[in-house]
Interface confidence: low
Amino acid sequence: DYKDDDDKGWMWNQFFVPEEMNKTDYHIGQLRSDLDNGNNSFQYKLLGAGAGSTFIIDERTGDIYAIEKLDREERSLYILRAQVIDSTTGRAVEPESEFVIRVSDINDNEPKFLDEPYEAIVPEMSPEGTLVIQVTATDADDPASGNNARLLYSLLQGQPYFSIEPTTGVIRISSKMDRELQDEYWVIIQAKDMIGLPGALSGTTSVLIKLSDVNDNKPIFKERLYRLTVSESAPTGTSIGRIMAYDNDIGENAEMDYSIEDDSQTFDIITNNETQEGIVILKKKVDFEHQNHYLIRANVKNRHVAEHLMEYHVEASTTFVRVQVEDEDEPPVFLLPYYLFEILEESPHGSFVGMVSATDPDQRKSPIRYSITRSKVFSIDDNGTIITTNPLDREISAWYNLSITATEKYNVQQISAVPVYVQVLNINDHAPEFSEYYDSYVCENAGSGQVIQTISAVDRDESVEDHHFYFNLSVEDTKNSSFIIIDNEDNTAVILTNRTGFSLQEEPVFYISVLIADNGIPSLTSTNTLTIHICDCDDYGSTQTCRDKDLLLSMGFRTE
């Protein structure tokens, strides 16, 4: 109670009323004027919100009562006005005055978690003390009223992995967790008011705590040895099989790279990023006959490993991959890419030309059969020996381009061909002859030693660098001696007159036999006739008219 400085004043309290009282006539307190001498002449009146409905006053005494249950959380403060009236005069004894009724709190509200549902993600293997999430409960009771709204948080479910700070609701890790054992935890938090003392109310919430993956597992091969096969005919780049490691981590932490530990020139491993399998690729063609299996060592490592997690990845997992090369039936292989043989023309039927050889590169070594495609001149036997079946004439064909096929006896589908070039070598089987037909003319009055014709020869045999023709007149013509021949020693010769004057009437035409020999071994000689016409020449010694007349005669005209 307190008294105003003024002599006249209210004696009154700031009143408190507990909420939720079951008694409807709860006595709050008493309003009293110090002018009231207790003789019941004063009348007390209550004005303002709640007066008469929620609160009443005993007009005689000034006692105030609450007549209905109050809820502090609905309304915690009532401001009322009081009057004191002299009942005898009906006049106010004091000026109207305000006072306050405060509804005092009782612990009638449990803590509530308003932000649920709670979900948190924390990396697995996080150390003790790592903050996960903070949960906050709200209590509608009065924080200023004792411990009614003072909350303490505790864990109903989640030990020993999590702990909660009792006053802040901060959830922390209290024990390392392995996502590979369990990837999420339901933690149940209880908030209790009254700092947990008897009579406290509580509320609970659930927190779903998910463990995010940390790269704490290395990939490990499922098998110690993988067996793969590859055909020797497989081209480079062929995928020959898959190997698989497993990693208990997920996502990026399970991404792995395979590699070949030995420096393999023949194989490579690439990672299939979808399946995380290792695909073994043929880097270089294999040959069953050279090497029929390979043993390679492969290892696997995670693609992304943070520095602080290296301890989990100290040793890479390794495995062996045995690649069996499958034999592919391959066609025969000739010893040489082509063959070049020589044979003399006019060699007899059955003459040896040369020998080809092919082998089966496969293990079973099939016998080989040979054949010559479309040839009437040569044949081949099963040993690869080529012989002639017809005479050869270099002057008809100096070269033969043959195709010889080798066929495996055990698998006639396996065929190889090789080009064979046969050169027919020259023998001296043709005598030289005039290179053209010569018609020669000489004037009747020709002098001795006059050149009347230069002759040359040809020979169908192969011309060699030092080939040489020798020119002579037949024995008869030499005796006759109207003409002589001089060999120029350059494969040409000149015919000269060997006398002065000829008679057109007596002997209009001379037929001279010219002998031409080559320098082959043995030498061949031919006899060639040279026709020499005697002409009636003009003063200038021209044989032209004689030639023209000859031309007309040859065309069927007569000349006189």
Epitope: M125, P160, Y161, S174, S175, K176, M177, D178, L181, Q182, D216, I220, F221, R224, E311, V314, E315, A316, S317, T318
Partner: antibody
Framework: QVQLVQSGAEVKKPGASVKVSCKAS????????MSWVRQAPGQGLEWMGI????????TYAQKFQGRVTMTGDTSTSTVYMELSSLRSEDTAVYYC?????????????WGQGTLVTVSS | HSVLTQSPSASGTPGQRVTISCSGS????????VNWYQQLPGTAPKLLIY???QRPSGVPDRFSGSKSGTSASLAISGLQSEDEADYYC???????????FGGGTKLTVLG
Amino acid sequence: QVQLVQSGAEVKKPGASVKVSCKASRYTFTSYYMSWVRQAPGQGLEWMGIIHPSGGDTTYAQKFQGRVTMTGDTSTSTVYMELSSLRSEDTAVYYCARGGIKLWLHFDYWGQGTLVTVSS
Amino acid sequence: HSVLTQSPSASGTPGQRVTISCSGSRSNIGSNFVNWYQQLPGTAPKLLIYTNNQRPSGVPDRFSGSKSGTSASLAISGLQSEDEADYYCAVWDDSLNGWVFGGGTKLTVLG
């Protein structure tokens, strides 16, 4: 200091079963694996299997598959190892040993051992 | 026989340095951490070295571990009489999906 206290010695007849317990204290029981290792008289150590007390996940050595069962009770922080169809060669000292938070991390604490004698 | 191979016995005089070896394969020593245990007569094994070369607190620095490829070794320098015990190597085996122990090496301190 971590403590692993094992049950007392047992004498069993061939064909019977034995159940050995190992009570853990002074650490978070559910965070670590527990292994069982045995040692026959005058012989070396032989690993039998491993259990994670939190989920009850177990891995057994091939030799004991079908004959051994490992269980855990988180309320009492105790693990159990039961071996059935006993034969004389099962006579050994059986140890529990605390592992790490991963299967492949070392055993740091061992129980005092339980002698199991199998004799007719 | 054990997956991990240890020589059955080793000996040395006080003050000497002794090495105990442990040989395995790619799936165990080659891929995982090696641990060494000391077993004094009549007692449970005690962790001596873990993760190849780490010493738990309380283990003297006379003991050291190393690993290379598929074999590991334990070295004891300044040998003392109280070091007389059985020594076991142990490692997780990826292929067997389980722990494997060496057969054990009995260390005798002479004189």
